[in-house]
């Protein structure tokens, strides 16, 4: 049994890091493998993660951690019984994938303005809370070409757009994702999408 693709890990910079790897053949990850991880810190202890299958030869493990700080470094040991298959390390702050924003809501009752709001996925005491920026994706269910991205580079989790920038009388969907420039993170997953019917009063044309 050998590791074909070494574990790569990403952290949500809160409580979970996710590591994925591939074996050289079909593997029952949960029964054959164990990933041991240990914070390099005074009086820390090794913790065991039981991996799950992620495709035939792929494995994934969700590592539970204390809230993360930038200096944290973890040692990782991948075991198959008594055989050490791979040894490495992981610095969560250098491999951050933020949590996805939640509670995306479209408020359509503000005089021809669409107000989209969502929730920051981090508690106020987490470093990322004040460092997230967002991308909002809006698309038409009827017209695949009607697909747009709005970059929200301010901290407030909201976006205002004129309803007239979208077509009237049709349904739209929106979703939002987050990233943090300070840690050069990857983008989060998209939030669940929300749907609304876009309708607004066409301005009266004078001739």
């Amino acid at each position: 049994m050998k590791v074909l693709q070494e574990p790569t890990c990403v952290s949500d910079y809160m409580s979970i890091s996710t590591c994925e790897w591939k074996m050289n053949g079909p593997t029952n990850c949960s029964t054959e493998l164990r990933l041991l991880y240990q914070l390099v810190f005074l009086l820390s202890e090794a913790h065991t993660c039981i991996p799950e299958n992620n495709g035939g030869a792929g494995c994934v493990c969700h590592l539970l951690m204390d809230d993360v700080v930038s200096a944290d470094n973890y040692t990782l040991d991948l075991w198959a019984g008594q055989q050490l298959l791979w040894k490495g390390s992981f610095k969560p702050s250098e491999h951050v994938k933020p949590r996805a924003p939640g509670n995306l809501t479209v408020h359509t009752n503000v005089s021809d303005t669409l107000l989209l709001t969502w929730s920051n996925p981090y508690p106020p005491d987490n470093y990322l809370y004040n460092h997230l920026t967002y991308a909002v994706n809006i698309w038409s269910e009827n017209d695949p070409a009607d697909f747009r991205i709005y970059n929200v580079t301010y901290l407030e989790p909201s976006l205002r757009i004129a309803a007239s920038t979208l077509k009237s009388g049709i349904s739209y969907r929106a979703r939002v994702r987050a990233w943090a420039q300070c840690y050069n993170t990857t983008w989060s997953e998209w939030s669940p999408s929300t749907k609304w019917h876009n309708s607004y009063r066409e301005p009266f044309e004078q001739h």
Epitope: L39, V40, F41, L42, L43, S44, E45, D66, D67, V69, S70, A71, D72
Partner: antibody, heavy 120, light 108 residues
Framework: EVQLLESGGGLVQPGGSLRLSCAAS????????MHWVRQAPGKGLEYVSG????????YYANSVKGRFTISRDNPKNTLFLQMSSLRAEDTAVYYC?????????????WGQGTTVTVSS | EIVLTQSPGTLSLSPGERATLSCRAS???????LAWYQQKPGQAPRLLIY???RRATGIPDRFSGSGSGTDFTLTISRLEPEDFAVYYC?????????FGQGTKLEIK
């Protein structure tokens, strides 16, 4: 309420032994690294010893290494410090301390302290 | 072993004034591992700040921490009568725990 209550302090002669206990309540002891910190009369804080959540790893300040032994009984939510070959300079108030996170984040819970006096 | 040196040894100020307490490490340390404690006579120490700048639960916002590398600061923006005490900085790191010798903040 999260609390730590030390006991076992007292007067002991140089070269003697003493065992301090710390009873934890309001939280699960096995989830945290635990420590002992001491303070000699009129002096500052001095780190003494620490132990990992399950007791598999220990750490000692150089001043007590080889003389003190830290241990824990997680099912009984109790921390111990066995002190032997005591010296006059070990005279201090001994505090039992919990760390904020599993391992780190500052010492957020302190006991009221138990006094150890080493004197002939 | 890393040594923490606090200054001044004693600081005499009046209520309402701003207090700035310094803690210098003998070598670079991570901001994640620097904490500050307050101790009043006859009482156990109380955690004020951890991770250099994060306030512990229940600590008023007049207390703030800053710094990096070897130089760290605890600031009390407007001194209240109950703030007069001894303050300790602490390194709680990957391989050791060390306290500074303390700064006594007294009423002028």
């Amino acid at each position: 309420e999260v609390q730590l209550l030390e006991s076992g302090g007292g007067l002991v002669q140089p070269g003697g032994s003493l065992r301090l206990s710390c009873a934890a309540s309001g939280f699960t002891l096995s989830s945290y690294a635990m420590h002992w910190v001491r303070q000699a009369p009129g002096k500052g804080l001095e780190y003494v010893s620490g132990i990992s959540p399950t007791g598999g790893s220990t750490y000692y300040a150089n001043s007590v290494k080889g003389r003190f032994t830290i241990s824990r009984d997680n099912p009984k939510n109790t921390l111990f410090l066995q002190m032997s070959s005591l010296r006059a300079e070990d005279t201090a108030v001994y505090y039992c301390v919990r760390v904020k996170g599993r391992y780190r984040g500052g010492m957020d819970v302190w006991g009221q302290g138990t006094t150890v006096t080493v004197s002939s | 072993e890393i040594v923490l040196t606090q200054s001044p040894g004693t600081l005499s100020l009046s209520p309402g004034e701003r207090a700035t307490l310094s803690c210098r490490a003998s070598q670079n340390i991570s901001t994640a591992y620097l904490a500050w404690y307050q101790q009043k006579p006859g009482q156990a120490p109380r955690l004020l700040i951890y991770g250099t700048s994060r306030r512990a639960t229940g600590i008023p916002d007049r207390f703030s921490g800053s710094g990096s590398g070897t130089d760290f600061t605890l600031t009390i923006s407007r001194l209240e009568p109950e703030d007069f005490a001894v303050y300790y900085c602490q390194l709680y790191g990957t391989s050791s725990v060390t306290f500074g010798q303390g700064t006594k903040l007294e009423i002028k």
